[in-house]
Interface confidence: medium
Amino acid sequence: APISSHCRLDKSNFQQPYITNRTFMLAKEASLADNNTDVRLIGEKLFHGVSMSERCYLMKQVLNFTLEEVLFPQSDRFQPYMQEVVPFLARLSNRLSTCHIEGDDLHIQRNVQKLKDTVKKLGESGEIKAIGELDLLFMSLRNACI
């Protein structure tokens, strides 16, 4: 089971209208540039076999990957939204840095790895797709971590 007290975010993180709006605007701009509508990164498959109490830990893994491998390298795109959203998401990642799971997390890593592989396989269009799903990432973090 996760160390659940550490796998939490205060709901105030998701109640800031300005940065919430900027996150959704960024996702919208990127999704307009995403021409691959057949693939969904954050969906039912991501959560398959993962209990509700483990979902925040899973979303932490997805958030860290998105920051490190997608948002930082793509940070020149989709301005002015990216400039404000990336530090906001980095702060959320930082607040989840003590969120761990005691015991086997192989089932979670397997699901996250599939998402990573999909992004890598699609190349730059995969990264654009990941940015286009930041609204889903935001909502999934909120639902899983508060």
Epitope: L67, E68, E69, F72, P73, S75, D76, R77, Q79, M82, Q83, V86, P87, A90, R91, S93, N94, S97, T98
Partner: antibody, heavy 124, light 108 residues
Framework: EVQLLESGGGLVQPGGSLRLSCAAS????????MSWVRQAPGKGLEWVST????????YHADSVKGRLTISRDNSKNTLYLEMNSLRVEDTAVYYC?????????????????WGQGTLVTVSS | EIVMTQSPAILSVSPGERATLSCRAS??????LAWFQQKPGQAPRLLIY???KRATGTPARFSGSGSGTDFTLTISSLEPEDFAVYFC??????????FGQGTKLEIK
Amino acid sequence: EVQLLESGGGLVQPGGSLRLSCAASGFTFSTYAMSWVRQAPGKGLEWVSTITSSGGATYHADSVKGRLTISRDNSKNTLYLEMNSLRVEDTAVYYCAKDWGRTVYAVIKDLDIWGQGTLVTVSS
Amino acid sequence: EIVMTQSPAILSVSPGERATLSCRASQSVSNYLAWFQQKPGQAPRLLIYDTSKRATGTPARFSGSGSGTDFTLTISSLEPEDFAVYFCQQRSDWPQYTFGQGTKLEIK
């Protein structure tokens, strides 16, 4: 050889201005974010500013916001720091550093290459 | 702002001996911690990144460990060229990088 070379430092009065430059060579400058870090005499290191690879986004420490501005010219492989309304506490050696970016093999995420620094002295 | 605190401020060790430098963060920085070495009149040089990974050119005698808030840089057997100032740095609170105040490693 990967190299960063700062210039433009010197003695300036409080309230004055300076423009620092950092010439990059030996790597694909346009694919990396770049940062300025400063070090007051005998003190520790302080992050000043970061700019993304093509200049689309800039970030500044609160202590310099509105006074120091980072920019870059990728056609000249050069990073800049425009310094206005300088204060005595801005006296420091200013280093430019290669920040995160993407290579064929990985995403580089640390300040792995630094210039030799240029000294800015603010004094009346 | 995440505050990084290094200890001790000055560490006196003899060549050939082991040196252990500590760095503590005011809140968790996960494993996003780097160590830099700085010699007088020179720029800092990246030694360790992501807590324990050696940067290109860093000798094997340097190792990093820790996670969360407490980190350690260990030099297994000190060489004369290792005497310098060492800084830790977090990049967890991006882009607000913060550094420790430094530990001066001097010859005993």
